[in-house]
């Protein structure tokens, strides 16, 4: 079903990025790009 | 600091959660990640919860762990333990942080 | 996923030598977000080295990383008795967050 294909490619794309600025702040220590509180 | 509590003897299938309790530490500011160690084996990345309170997991570990948050604490809920999570789990603020760790045995 | 490949294991240098540890990556680790860390018996993991080879804050110079891609190596030059541990690597990996190397021993004679 295109909706659940569309739904799943947007999870790993947001999880994708959240780990990328995950390891910029744990293994490079990058404070910067830490995720602020919403 | 960063310590971890709520490990204990459970039977297959009980779930479990573990609490990392910090001090000193804002968990608006911080990247919590949790870790496993199964006896005498190597380290596993379990996965982490962000400032804003979402959290996300290795493949092998989704579905089977929750990781949520207070102000004070981070909990790991392990929802259908098996024998293959016996392990100490650890607790630590983005990598370079970490409390002395929890054990859980899993058994029948 | 990637997989991080530690190599060799034990690793034994006499006190004063320089021991190497290597680490390879089955795919590129993103950023060279690599880290390495050192483990005691009964104690949690310790961050020596971050980013391939920034070292940590308080942890001795005799510790250096080097490396990009998916090779990386840790050396520890002027082995001291309080080095004798367990070493992992860990690198990041878009996909899946953290993997960690099977750890190396290292022994001090």
């Known amino acids: 079903h295109s909706d659940g294909i569309f739904t799943d490619s947007y999870s790993r794309y947001r999880k994708q990025m959240a780990v990328k600025k995950y390891l910029a702040a744990v293994l490079g220590k990058r404070y910067k790009q830490r995720v602020k509180n919403k | 600091s960063v310590e971890e509590s709520g490990g204990r003897l459970v039977t297959p299938g009980t779930p479990l959660t573990l609490t990392c309790t910090v001090s000193?530490?804002?968990?608006?500011?911080?990247?919590m990640t949790w870790v496993r160690q199964a006896p005498g084996k190597g380290l596993e990345w379990i996965g982490f919860i962000d400032a804003g309170g979402d959290a996300y997991y290795a493949s092998w570990a989704k579905g089977r762990f929750t990781i949520s948050k207070t102000s004070t604490t981070v909990d790991l809920k392990i929802t259908s333990p098996t024998t293959e999570d016996t392990a100490t789990y650890f607790c630590?603020?983005?990598?370079?942080?970490w409390g002395q760790g929890t054990l859980v045995t899993v058994s029948s | 996923a990637a997989v991080l490949t530690q190599t060799p294991s034990p690793v034994s240098a006499a006190v004063g030598g320089t021991v190497t540890i290597n680490c390879q990556s089955s795919?590129?680790?993103?950023?060279?977000?690599l880290a390495w860390f050192q483990q005691k018996p009964g104690q949690p993991p310790k961050l020596l080295i971050y980013e391939a080879s920034k070292l940590e804050s308080g942890v001795p110079s005799r510790f250096s990383g080097s490396g990009s891609g998916t090779q990386f190596t840790l050396t520890i030059s002027d082995l001291q008795c309080d080095d004798a541990a367990t070493y992992y690597c860990a690198g990041g990996d878009i996909s899946e967050g953290v993997a960690f190397g099977g750890g190396t021993e290292v022994v001090v004679k």
């Open positions: 795919e590129s680790v993103y950023g060279n977000y």
């Open positions: 000193g530490i804002d968990l608006n500011s911080y990247y």
């Open positions: 630590a603020r983005d990598l370079d942080l």
